[in-house]
């Protein structure tokens, strides 16, 4: 099937790199400066991604291949291909329609993007606060309130629960 | 044709102060924010300060907080940036950006090529 593509259609013995230039029969020519072809039998080269501006280039354009973009340090790539650069905030902030603002009271965000999430609420486990949430770190949880028996100390380990009826061994 | 122009750089002493401008043309100037950037030799290109359509700002570089200020004026389709106390670290090219919207650049966004602000101590 190959070979008889082939000699029905000269362009599929193009490589990746060149394209079948209709003004010159069919010729398999390079790609143009600033152009690629990342198949074979193309009959076109597309033109090479610019990273400008916000965007740095992350990999060069070269006859096969695109060229990839990432972000200018103080921005975040989204989308396929790192289509769009997001602004980054700090941590303890989540990006609004204004800009970045602080984590309200009650919700944290330890990174540079993304929104400010609920602290855990320890209670809903039986457990109680060991280290108070921050706007850039969640509540440590530590053992239930009726596990820290006068004197205990409330850093020490939760002895690992028992399965009903299982005697210590 | 869509073109946005820098201009109002130069050389200036350190704690001196210059005015650089952004002028836009070839699209809906009201419909855009306007971003400066700065790219200093050897160093990576870093956001200096966003205005947005509305004329909010956001600041990308804590650096500059108090010592440079945004603002457009529309009717002229130019945006400046105010800077007052530069210091030799503040030397760079200063280029404009037009996104829409001062937290989301894309592919499609128009870039000036930039302006050369050097400081000398």
């Known amino acids: 099937f190959e070979r008889t593509r082939s000699l029905q259609d000269p362009c599929s013995n193009c490589p990746a790199g060149t394209f079948c230039d209709n003004n010159r029969n069919q010729i398999c020519s390079p790609c143009p400066p600033n152009s690629f072809s990342s198949a074979g039998g193309q009959r076109t080269c597309d033109i090479c991604r610019q990273c400008k501006g916000v965007f740095r280039t992350r990999k060069e354009c070269s006859s096969t291949s695109n060229a990839e973009c990432d972000c200018t340090p103080g921005f975040h790539c989204l989308g396929a291909g790192c289509s769009m650069c997001e602004q980054d905030c700090k941590q303890g902030q989540e990006l609004t329609k204004k800009g970045c603002k602080d984590c309200c009271f009650g919700t944290f965000n330890d990174q540079k993007r993304g929104i400010c999430r609920p602290w855990t609420n320890c209670s809903l486990d039986g457990k109680s606060v060991l280290v108070n949430g921050t706007k850039e770190r969640d509540v440590v949880c530590g053992p239930s309130p009726a596990d820290l028996s006068p004197g205990a100390s409330s850093v020490t380990p939760p002895a690992p629960a028992r399965e009903p009826g299982h005697s210590p061994q | 044709q869509v073109q946005l122009q820098e201009s109002g750089g130069g050389l200036v002493q350190a704690g001196g102060s210059l005015r650089l401008s952004c002028a836009a043309s070839?699209?809906?100037?009201?419909?855009?924010?306007i971003g400066w950037f700065r790219q200093a030799p050897g160093k990576e290109r870093e956001g200096v300060l966003c205005?947005?359509?509305?004329?909010?700002?956001?600041y990308y570089a804590d650096s500059v907080k108090g010592r440079f200020t945004i603002s457009r004026d529309n009717a002229k389709n130019t945006v400046y940036l105010q800077m007052t106390n530069l210091k030799p670290e503040d030397t760079a090219v200063y280029l404009c950006?037009?996104?829409?919207?001062?937290?989301?650049?894309?592919?499609?966004?128009?870039w000036g090529q930039g302006t050369q602000v050097t400081v000398s101590s």
């Open positions: 205005i947005s359509s509305s004329g909010g700002s956001t």
């Open positions: 950006g037009a996104p829409r919207d001062c937290s989301y650049y894309t592919s499609d966004d128009y």
């Open positions: 070839g699209f809906t100037f009201d419909d855009y924010a």
